[in-house]
């Protein structure tokens, strides 16, 4: 039957790893509920949507953000929530749907003509509005890359890693986000053990480069948990 085929091909909906580290079981995420099946001539809906646990926006779909489902709810319980449309309230860019960003607590259109000059202003303004802005400003698909005529060089203000040139990622620096170098083999990296701990970083490191993963440095295995040093190592 169709259902058994779907179930056998489904990516298992497992809870995400702490900190959302790549390379651990999680679930890739999916298309809109309406799906065109091969051989069919109409859309059939699979109602398999369920609240998806997350630790950061990047674990959610491009039309979602990661937050506590209730106002003032348990900070430790976060799920992927639907993004907010234009003129809805927001506390950071990631809350706004693609094509919009958060300005003065409201989702507004990412107008090509005036957006660039407002990035820094918006980041600074929103930082003062609510502590949750520390959870990141990136809206994955808010702004098409063509809004930037050139990719950001090291130190350039950015919203997401695709705004940066190859070999750089978009990472937090104080209350802004700038393009920083992707980590090389042997460089110290950050492995988040506590859910949501990424939000506490004022100086965020990039992820490890292609072919590398963030692992405990071999000679630090005996050290206490709190002092373990992680470095980028070959798979």
């Amino acid at each position: 039957t169709l259902n058994s085929v779907l179930n056998s091909n489904a990516i298992k909906n497992l809870p995400p790893p702490l900190g959302g580290a790549a390379g651990h079981p999680g679930s890739a995420v999916s298309a809109a509920p309406g799906i065109l099946y091969p051989g069919g001539n109409k859309y059939q809906t699979i109602d398999n949507y369920q609240p998806y646990p997350c630790a950061e926006d990047e674990e959610c779909g491009t039309d979602e953000y990661c937050a506590s489902p209730t106002r003032g709810g348990d900070a430790g319980v976060q799920i992927c929530l639907a993004c907010r449309k234009r003129r809805k309230r927001c506390m950071r860019h990631a809350m706004c749907c693609p094509g919009n960003y958060c300005k003065n607590g409201i989702c507004v259109s990412s107008d090509q003509n005036h957006f660039r000059g407002e990035i820094e202003e918006t980041i600074t303004e929103s930082f003062g509005n609510d502590h949750s802005t520390l959870d990141g400003y990136s809206r994955r698909t808010t702004l098409s890359s063509k809004m930037y005529h050139t990719k950001g060089q090291e130190g350039s203000v950015c919203l997401r890693s695709s705004d940066c040139a190859s070999g750089l990622c978009c990472a937090r620096h104080f209350w802004s986000k700038i393009c920083k170098p992707v980590l090389k083999e042997g460089q110290v990296c950050t492995k988040h053990r506590r859910k949501g701990s990424h939000g506490l970083e004022i100086f965020q490191r990039c992820y490890c480069g292609e072919g590398l993963s963030c692992r405990i440095q071999k000679d630090h295995h005996q050290a206490s948990n709190s002092s373990r040093l992680h470095t980028c190592q070959r798979h």
């Epitope: 995420v29 998806y52 992927c80």
Partner: nanobody, 125 residues
Framework: EVQLVESGGGLVQAGDSLRLSCTAS????????VGWFRQAPGKEREFVTA????????DYADSVKGRFTISRDNAKNTAYLQMNSLKPEDTAVYYC??????????????????WGQGTQVTVSS
């Protein structure tokens, strides 16, 4: 529209490593989930691994966990499959696929709307 091209396949010995690349043309790649599937002669196509738009989420079939690693570089419009400790049973045509990544929920094979032509991986004992 996204066109996908796989490369990096070949003939290797059991225990060796191989890295497959999936290069995409089309701006939708960076907001797509990317998956690798494989099909051995006379068998059905099976899921191998997948990675979400940002690389923050990955998933692996039990048969490849700990041996295969999926990664992506959105700046280069490319996804990678690093295959270590290869076994003869890994012999198959490997396909790269991509689909919309709008919502965090289960993704079925049918929702991968773009597929590559495949690259042959042969592992001899």
């Amino acid at each position: 529209e996204v066109q996908l091209v796989e490369s990096g396949g070949g003939l290797v010995q059991a225990g060796d490593s191989l890295r497959l690349s999936c290069t995409a043309s089309g701006s939708a790649f960076s907001s797509s989930v990317v998956g690798w599937f494989r099909q051995a002669p006379g068998k059905e196509r099976e899921f191998v691994t997948a990675i979400n738009w940002s690389g923050a989420r990955t998933d692996y079939a039990d048969s490849v966990k700990g041996r295969f690693t999926i990664s992506r570089d959105n700046a280069k419009n490319t996804a990678y499959l690093q295959m270590n400790s290869l076994k003869p049973e890994d012999t198959a045509v490997y396909y790269c696929a991509a689909g919309s990544d709008r919502y965090a929920r289960v993704l079925t094979e049918y929702e991968y709307v773009w597929w590559g032509q495949g690259t042959q991986v042969t592992v001899s004992s």
